[in-house]
């Protein structure tokens, strides 16, 4: 039975040209995390493999940095970066856990972080 929950940074906003950290945390399970994939729609942004480290997809290499931890840093943000991002935790023996983050990239400097929330 899958008992874990993913806590994410939730709905967040950031300024155009700035950077943002996408973070997820898996809790309430003893399952071993073998890999975390970061995705945007059908695009794979990055893979963090427990044994092999980070792979950043070539299309994002100039604007995406690994970490901190299992998180992902998006840099040089544009309004086109607005949208849903997903952290996919591949675990053994539980299977797959998915967390969702919505990022809004704003033109002005009024960007503020939203509240944290949980996805069971």
């Amino acid at each position: 039975m899958m008992t874990g929950t993913i806590e994410t940074t939730g709905n967040i906003s950031a300024e155009k040209g700035g950077s943002i950290i996408l973070q997820c945390h898996l809790s309430s399970t003893t399952a071993q995390v073998t890999q975390v994939n970061w995705e945007q729609q059908d695009q794979l942004l990055a893979i963090c493999n427990a044994d092999l480290g980070w792979h950043i997809s070539p299309s994002f290499k100039d604007r995406v940095a690994p970490g901190p931890g299992l998180g992902l840093t998006l840099q040089s943000l544009t309004v086109n970066d607005t949208g849903e991002y997903f952290c996919i935790y591949h675990t053994y023996p539980d299977g797959t856990y998915t967390g969702r983050i919505f990022l809004e990239v704003l033109e002005s400097s009024v960007a503020e972080h939203g509240a944290r929330f949980q996805i069971p």
Partner: antibody, heavy 120, light 107 residues
Amino acid sequence: EVQLQESGPGLVKPSETLSLTCAVSGYSITSDSWNWIRQPPGKKLEWMGYISYSGNTYYNPSLKSRITISRDTSKNQFSLKLSSVTAADTAVYYCARLDFSNYGGAVDYWGQGTTVTVSS
Amino acid sequence: DIVMTQTPLSLSVTPGQPASISCKASQNVRTAVAWYQQKPGQSPQLMIYSASYRYTGVPDRFSGSGSGTDFTLKISRVEAEDVGVYYCQQYYTTPWTFGGGTKVEIK
């Protein structure tokens, strides 16, 4: 340039243990990921498992109870042991390098392959 | 495990003509797909990674496309040296898995 060379017996008896070694030149096995991939006659390529730069191993669950991948950093080589073999383990066995950081799970260097037949 | 299904099984192409190989994943693998070429008597060689990026030294007549579950390897103008078997592979999640291969022959 990275070069990989498989060696080991071409004939193994059923129920015995298949043992192969991959000698690596031009690159240290304390970097990247070192893999075994096989291809039974007329069948798909099958990824068997890897040993990482740090010595961690990951095995294909279909082989998990029978497979061991180890390394000897002093000789810059890594090895495959597959126990309790049957005719279904007859295949061409490849050792291969994977540069996860740059290419994800895509294998960029392969050995020439060695044919292993399981027969009494 | 994710199953990768390739079509067609074989392809006979006139030199200078285009060729197209399809690969379908049993679940969404985003862009975590590689393509390999295996010439007769040789080991596989990496051609494409991340669905559409050519590996070092691969001629630009080879191109990869697709995301999600449907992927394509195209050869814009087939040459005699392109004969061999082409394989797709997913690395979205372990165990990494390969397609069954497509044999390209010259007419």
